[in-house]
């Protein structure tokens, strides 16, 4: 195939791949008709002048995972047809000025996972056709004004995993075509007002895992096309009332792992496409009326691992589409009987690891489709008569780790549980806490020396013994098992998406096995 170097493989499709530690320089002669060249996992440490001079038809060049630390300015001379250039996963600390000169067709430039300390406006001033620039995983501490001014066609810019401590409000001003901007895993403490104003076509903005404390009220007001906004794992303590008001296209918003103490009513301005909202691991103490009322299409709401002690009766107004509600691991002592009344389509609710002492008899009155209720590890001594009677689809109910008071008043509950044992699961059953003579005995089989009043019990639906939600030990008590989501180790991937993060937290989802796929 027009002379393929012995250390490379060449295909009929004009593709050349050179790999292996024995390669210490760009192999020669390369086939003159090569259109794609990959140099991977070699011991090449430098690129000298014009090593690709005779392959001017090259369209894609990948020089990745090498020992490359030095490049001569003319290394890519004569590659005017090149559209894709990757120098990712090398050891570059410095880019020579003019390195990309003459690469008039270049559309994608990948410089990620190197050791670059700085970039300058002159580096990319010739790259007027560039659409994608990947700079993540370097050691950049600041971006000078003008660095991207010539990249007017850029649609994707990744600056994640650097050491940026601040961003100039002018640095992105000419990037009107940018669709994706990633600044995750830096050291940003604030974002100046106006920073994103020129980004009218922005669809994704990744700011997670920084140290951002405050958001300017109008920070996103020009980003009407924004679909995904990642703000999780920062230090955000409050949300300006209008900060999310101009984001009608938003379908992903992550705010978990911040320091939010309160949410003002209507803070989540009309977002008709938002289907999941993850707010776990904040410091939220109460939920006022109508706080989520603009989120008419929300299906999943995760509020676990906060400090919520009060929920206003109208807090969940408007959430007519909600299927899953996670409130576990909070400080709830009481719930208003009407708090869930508007959640007609709710299937799963997790309330475990709170301080609930009692539940109103009508707490689930309008939530007829409930399939799973997590109530373990609270302070419940009894439950009102008939609280679950209308829940014909209920197939998972977790009641263990509560201080059940096994006197004569417990009989109606005991009898209902006796007839509905499959719904309780097999892992851990509720046991009596008092009186002392029956402590530790199963609530279901306890013999209470009183006449058993007749109790109407509904027929148990023939549902699987354990429903089908996420499976995992319940946080924080890893000794007893509830079926919640399997969370394992922290994820190092850059996007945190609308999910949990976590080192060894064993449950954020906190649902069980009854929800839908």
């Amino acid at each position: 195939y027009h002379g393929c170097p012995s250390e490379c493989t060449c295909s009929r499709a004009s593709q050349v791949e050179c790999t292996g530690a024995r390669i210490v320089a760009v192999p020669t002669p390369l086939p003159w008709n090569a259109m794609s060249l990959q140099i991977l996992n070699t011991h090449i440490t430098e690129l000298n002048e014009s090593p690709f001079l005779n392959i001017s038809a090259l369209i894609a060049l990948r020089i990745e995972k090498n020992e490359l630390s030095r490049i001569t300015p003319g290394a890519f001379r004569n590659l005017g047809s090149l559209r894709y250039l990757s120098l990712a996963n090398n050891k570059l600390q410095v880019l020579p000025i003019g390195l990309f000169q003459g690469l008039d067709s270049l559309e994608s430039l990948l410089l990620s996972s190197n050791q670059l300390l700085q970039i300058q406006p002159a580096h990319f001033s010739q790259c007027s056709n560039l659409k994608e620039l990947q700079l993540h995983g370097n050691h950049l501490e600041y971006i000078p004004d003008g660095a991207f001014d010539h990249l007017v066609g850029l649609t994707k810019l990744n600056l994640g995993k650097n050491s940026l401590t601040h961003i100039s409000p002018r640095v992105f001003q000419h990037l009107g075509n940018l669709q994706v901007l990633r600044l995750y895993e830096n050291r940003l403490t604030d974002i100046p007002m106006g920073t994103f104003d020129g980004l009218v076509n922005l669809q994704e903005l990744a700011l997670q895992q920084n140290q951002i404390g405050l958001l300017s009220p109008g920070l996103f007001h020009n980003n009407h096309n924004l679909q995904r906004l990642y703000l999780s794992n920062n230090h955000i303590s409050q949300l300006p009332p209008s900060v999310f008001m101009q984001l009608p296209q938003l379908n992903r918003l992550t705010l978990f792992g911040n320091s939010l103490k309160e949410l003002s009513p209507g803070i989540f301005g009309p977002m008709p496409n938002l289907r999941e909202l993850w707010l776990y691991d904040n410091h939220i103490s109460s939920l006022p009326d109508n706080v989520f009322s603009n989120l008419r299409q929300l299906q999943v709401l995760i509020l676990s691992r906060n400090q919520i002690s009060f929920i206003s009766p109208g807090a969940f107004n408007g959430l007519t589409e909600l299927r899953e509600l996670s409130l576990h691991t909070n400080a709830l002592q009481d719930l208003d009987g009407n708090v869930f009344r508007m959640l007609a389509n709710l299937q799963n609710i997790s309330l475990q690891n709170n301080r609930l002492r009692q539940l109103p008899g009508n707490i689930f009155a309008n939530v007829n489709g409930l399939m799973a209720i997590q109530l373990q590890n609270n302070q419940l001594e009894n439950l009102p008569l008939g609280i679950f009677d209308h829940l014909g689809k209920l197939c998972e109910l977790r009641l263990y780790d509560n201080p059940w008071r096994c006197d004569s008043d417990i009989l109606p509950l005991r009898n209902w549980l006796l007839l509905n044992q499959p719904r309780l699961g097999t892992d851990t059953v509720p046991v009596c806490f008092s009186p002392a003579n029956v402590r530790g005995q199963s609530l279901i089989i306890i013999n209470v020396n009183v006449a058993v009043p007749s109790v109407h019990v509904p027929e148990v639906p023939s549902y699987p013994e354990t429903p089908w939600y996420p499976d995992t030990p319940s946080y924080p008590d890893t000794t007893s098992v509830s079926s919640t989501t399997e969370l394992t180790s922290p994820v190092e991937d850059y996007t945190d998406l609308t999910t949990i993060q976590v080192t060894d937290d064993r449950s954020v989802w906190g649902m069980t096995q009854a929800q839908s796929g």
């Epitope: 289907r275 999941e276 299906q299 589409e321 399997e486 999910t499 949990i500 796929g517």
Partner: antibody
Framework: EVQLVQSGAEVKKPGSSVKVSCKAS????????IHWVKQAPGQGLEWIGL????????NYNQKFKGKATLTVDTSTTTAYMEMSSLRSEDTAVYYC????????????WGQGTTVTVSS | DIVLTQSPDSLAVSLGERATINCRAS??????????MHWYQQKPGQPPKLLIK???SLESGVPDRFSGSGSGTDFTLTISSLQAEDVAVYYC????????FGGGTKVEIK
């Protein structure tokens, strides 16, 4: 371009295990749910379960609990499904598929992996 | 589990003619806003391809001769003018509870 590329066909003995991979590219792997679906020869489709890569959270169809184990490796943007204690009725094509939100449809599918269980 | 019953099992339609496939759920899969019903097309040797999501929303890149309708328990996939490339098996799927699929409807050219 969004792609889900699955591992090649497998022939296994009854009682053994198989691990099928699904390599994702062209999208942010941790931002989507990955579903697994079974299609036995000449049969319809059967949902096995899903995994949410960022939290490694899973949901299973009760029927496949204990049979299938779903995992992910976010560093390589790959999802895995391991099937244990294989029997002849596990012979099928297994698909991975992507979903944007938990209750959304599956908008991109892998090409499928044929697993044949035969002594 | 929710059972989805598709009808007919197979369907032969002339090129350019309308094809209609029905899917009935054993219980409602709709709210006031959404129906949690989706439609897929599967050609021999290929994976399923999403056509319609949430009962009536056409997936990006799918020809507009495909349309979906219905709510509650009864849903319909319509191909307004059958083309040769539409020969396939069509499946409905619900995501209201544990996901289940219909048995499939084979569409052929008459």
């Amino acid at each position: 371009e969004v792609q889900l590329v699955q591992s090649g066909a497998e022939v296994k003995k009854p009682g053994s295990s198989v691990k099928v991979s699904c390599k994702a590219s062209g999208f942010t792997f941790t931002d989507y749910y990955i579903h697994w679906v079974k299609q036995a020869p000449g049969q319809g489709l059967e949902w096995i379960g899903l995994v949410y890569p960022y939290i490694h959270g899973t949901n299973y169809n009760q029927k496949f609990k204990g049979k299938a184990t779903l995992t992910v490796d976010t560093s390589t943007t790959t999802a895995y499904m391991e099937m244990s204690s294989l029997r002849s009725e596990d012979t099928a094509v297994y698909y991975c598929a992507r979903g944007d939100n938990k209750y959304d449809a599956m908008d991109y599918w892998g090409q499928g992996t044929t697993v044949t269980v035969s002594s | 589990d929710i059972v989805l019953t598709q009808s007919p099992d197979s369907l032969a339609v002339s090129l350019g003619e309308r094809a209609t496939i029905n899917c009935r759920a054993s219980q409602s899969v709709s709210t006031s806003s959404y129906s949690y019903m989706h439609w897929y097309q599967q050609k021999p040797g290929q994976p399923p391809k999403l056509l319609i999501k949430y009962a009536s929303s056409l997936e990006s890149g799918v020809p507009d001769r495909f349309s979906g309708s219905g709510s509650g328990t009864d849903f319909t996939l319509t191909i307004s003018s059958l083309q040769a490339e539409d020969v396939a098996v069509y499946y409905c799927e619900q995501s209201w509870e544990i996901r289940t699929f219909g048995g499939g409807t084979k569409v052929e050219i008459k």
